[in-house]
Each structure stands twice: as C-alpha cells, then as structure tokens.
C-alpha cells in the first residue's frame, strides 16, 4: 500500500499505510445536522449519517473470528453510567452529589452538545487531514521552541484525570508559531486506542495512528485560559502522531515507566523534569495547520492546531503500556480516548511544505491545490 503523504522524514520516520478516504470532510453534513461525538468510538454510523465505505473515523478492530466484520457496541469498553449504584473496586468512583451532565465521557451519553453547546459548532476538532487538499503556505515558518529542556527539579505533576494522562508544565516554556504569534506551554496529554486498535484523534486520509500527543499552549496575549477560551488564536496545540518502531523511545519512557503509579483515576505522581521537545518530532519545519477546537468539552473554538508531518516512534511495548495501564471512571480501562473526526465545513488545512505534490505513480490526474490563506502574512 502507498504511504499517505505523511513524509518518511528521518530520523523518526513517517506515516504507515492507510486507506484512501473516498469522500472529503467538506462533503460531510454540518455539525449542527449530525453531531457525532455522542457515538462511541467505533460505533457504526447511523443510517443516513455517512454510510461511506472506508470511513475510518473509527478504530480498526479485528473481530474475534479474525474475519472482517463491523464493530459492535459490545466490543467497546464499558463505562459506569452516572448514577450506577455499584461501588467500583478501584476507588475511582462516580461523584454522586452533583451528578450532572458535565461528567462527559467517550462513547456514550450524555451527548456532548448537551454538555457544552460549543461541541456542536461548525469548526471543531479533530479533523481528517487530506494532504492533497492542503494549501501550501510558504509563510508558515519552522516552529520555535524555547525553554522546553527542563531540569530534573522542580518535579512535574503527572495525573490520571480519567480522560487522559496529563503532565502539567511549569512556566517558561515558550513557543512561537511565527512572528508575533507567541505562546506559553501549559500541559501535555495523550490520546490512544486499545490492543490492535489505533487511537489518534486526527487522521490522515482516513488513516488513524496508534496514538497522539497534544501540547497545549496559551497565547501570551492572555494571562489565563478562561480568558482565552473561544478567542481566535487564544490557545494553540502542537500535535504529533505516535507510531510503532523497533526501539524504545527513551524520552517517552520517562513518563510511561510511571503510569503504574497513577493507574487509578484521580491519582497523580511527581516526575523529574525532562526535555519536553524530545517528545515531539525533530522536524519543526513540516506541519499542517488549521483553526479548530478543543477535542473535549467544552469544545471551545478558535484553537490553532499544528499537526507535525513527521511522526514519533515508540516501541510496541511502550504503546501497549500506554493503552493498557490506566483506569478511567468506574471499573473501565482508560482506552479509546479519542473524539471522532469532525467536518471541515469549508476550512482549508494549510501546510508548511508542498504536501499536495505527490511524486508517487498513483497521482495520475492533476491535483487542484487550495490557495494559501496565509500568503499575505
């Protein structure tokens, strides 16, 4: 199979093979027509919703018979519903007082727009990236990171928050998307799947990667997140896909080796400071960028997403540790913690490199590239 146009950049390598999505996000119904985040990851599309062959918003699954088959609801991790009477065994139980709609979850009720109306917005994340439709923008310069190489002290808080594993970052990590577009890193977290089921949030031509890292930043124009929510450019996220490689990733091992300590929902531990930039791809010059939203409630829009073209390699054992160690609400494993891809609704994804120029023999017909919106910057 042909590699999607995630370039095989050394040293960390590129994308792995994936199916072509026969329909672009632009053709999908708007978020208001069919908000999809209430669907469990992997749930089959409802009639009339998308019903497309090759739709890969959903995790790949090998049915027990090893034959091709559709994913059934019983294959999904069970999550204790609000109000379930049983007391979980792992001491991470449902809050009984204030059991309102704010306790959202992946793959079940309540529907996210009921939790936060912004989740039904038109410019949501994540999205499927189709490099052939990306607009090459020479104005998108290499990302600049300063202060990301942290000393061992002070230690950092690593927490299982029931939705992900989150590392809170100290002050002083500066990131620039370009001149005058300066940010401060706040925290990083991961999204993953389950055994044999990929769990990245963004996809490339319908291909879902094993996992994805998000480093969340606040614009220097704002003092606090609550001021920046929903403001264009107020928040920026650096995202990178995690793939399986032959060797252990020593940077990630500094975090993954501590996951056992925070297996229970709500638990936290202190980890020595580390080189945060080592968790990201080495090539800061090749990336995709678009404006979207937070991928969890309240789903606030105006978030600048920068998705690296280069991927990060972890060993099979490390990816297994990531997806098989933590517990979420009730007695459910913390797995498949990704939101389905959302319609672009006319948005154009920009690329800092000519991603649409396909040198492979498959590119028989001419490709119509979108124009670069940032050309006048």
């Amino acid at each position: 199979q042909r590699l999607p146009r995630m370039q095989e950049d050394s040293p960390l390598g590129g994308g792995s093979s994936g199916e072509d999505d026969p329909l672009g996000e632009e053709d999908l119904p708007s978020e208001e027509d069919s908000p999809r985040e209430e669907d469990p990851p992997g749930e089959e599309d409802l009639p009339g919703e998308e019903d497309l062959p090759g739709e890969e918003d959903l995790p790949e699954v090998k049915p027990k018979s090893e034959e091709e088959g559709s994913l059934k609801l019983e294959d999904l991790p069970t999550v204790e519903a609000p109000g379930d009477p049983q007391e979980p065994q792992n001491n991470a139980h449902r809050d009984k007082e204030g059991d309102d709609q704010s306790h959202w979850r992946y793959g079940g009720d309540p529907p996210w727009p009921r939790v936060s109306p912004a989740c039904a917005g038109r410019f949501q994340s994540p999205v499927d990236i189709r490099p052939q439709l990306a607009a090459f923008c020479p104005a998108l310069r290499p990302l600049e990171l300063l202060g990301f190489q942290l000393p061992p002290l002070p230690e950092l808080r690593l927490r299982n928050n029931g939705h992900s594993v989150q590392l809170t970052l100290p002050p002083g990590l500066e990131m620039a998307l370009g001149p005058g577009r300066e940010y401060r890193a706040l925290q990083l977290h991961l999204h993953w799947g389950a055994a044999g089921r990929p769990g990245s949030e963004h996809t490339v031509e319908g291909h879902r990667f094993p996992a994805e890292i998000h480093v969340v930043h606040l614009s220097t124009a704002f003092a606090r997140v609550d001021e920046a929510l929903g403001r264009p450019g107020g928040l920026a996220v650096l995202a990178a896909f995690l793939e399986e490689g032959p060797e252990e990733n020593s940077a990630y091992e500094q975090l993954l080796s501590r996951l056992e300590e925070i297996a229970e929902e709500g638990s936290e531990t202190q980890v020595p400071g580390l080189d945060i930039s080592a968790l990201l791809p080495s090539d800061f010059s090749r990336y995709f960028q678009y404006e979207g939203s937070l991928t969890t409630p309240p789903c606030a829009q105006g978030v600048i997403w920068t998705v690296f073209n280069q991927t990060v390699m972890l060993s099979a054992k490390q990816l297994h540790t990531l997806s098989d160690t933590l517990w979420g609400p009730g007695d459910s494993r913390l797995q498949l913690n990704f939101r389905a891809t959302q319609p672009l609704n006319g948005r154009v994804i920009e690329a800092s490199f000519p991603a649409g120029v396909d040198s492979s023999p498959r590119a028989a017909e001419p490709v119509q590239l979108n124009s670069c919106l940032a050309a006048g910057d």
Partner: nanobody, 117 residues
C-alpha cells in the same frame, strides 16, 4: 478573572468536624464544571500533599491518610467545591488549598485548619 475563595477553616478539637468550601467566581463558569478539582494541604514545615480530587470524568480519590474520614464533593451549579472533614486528628493541621485544573492550575489562597485540644 477566576478567583477561588476557600472558607470553613478554623480551630477544632480532635474528633471534631469541619466543612471546607471553595467558591469559584469570575470566568469560572467557563471552566469549573470541566475541570478536575482538588484539595491539597500543606502542614507546617512540610510539602504540598494531595488530599482528595474529583476528576473531570467524575471519579473521586482520597489520600490514604484521610480515606474514610473526609468526603469531597462539588456543586457545578454553584461553582463550588466542598471537603467534609470528620474525625479530625492533630496531624490534619495544615493550610488547605483548593485547586482547579483545567489546562492550567488555579489556586485559592488557602484556609487554615488547626486540630488541637
């Protein structure tokens, strides 16, 4: 601006009870209900210790030293976090801080709890 204001601290005898409250104001309506919220404490001459947390997913967790005696709860309609403390001991004496964690940490100014006869 999000402001977290703790209240309910004071002097109590061993075996007694207190209820701490942490009220969030300002833009907190945007974030409180989506945040993990927690109580930390700092005893004299000691480091910061996590007492209890309610995660954004709704689960609760307690440190071993308070399990069975303390109960954490939240009321998102009031943007308020609570900590019911029963069977208090001298070693519970500390400044208790409210923490709201939504992409970044928000902290209260702390309320002093003194357990002494």
């Amino acid at each position: 601006q999000v402001q977290l204001v703790e209240s309910g601290g004071g002097l109590v005898q061993p075996g007694g009870s207190l209820r701490l409250s942490c009220s969030a104001s300002g833009n907190s309506a945007n974030i409180f209900s989506f945040a993990s919220v927690a109580w930390y404490r700092q005893a004299p001459g000691k480091g910061l210790e996590l007492v209890s947390v309610i995660t954004s997913a709704g689960g609760t967790k307690y440190s071993d030293s308070v399990k069975g005696r303390f109960t954490i709860s939240r009321d998102n309609s009031k943007n308020t976090l609570y900590l019911q403390m029963n069977s208090l001991r001298a070693e519970d004496t500390a400044v208790y801080y409210c923490n709201v964690d939504y992409l970044q940490d928000y902290w209260g100014q702390g309320t002093l709890v003194t357990v002494s006869s």
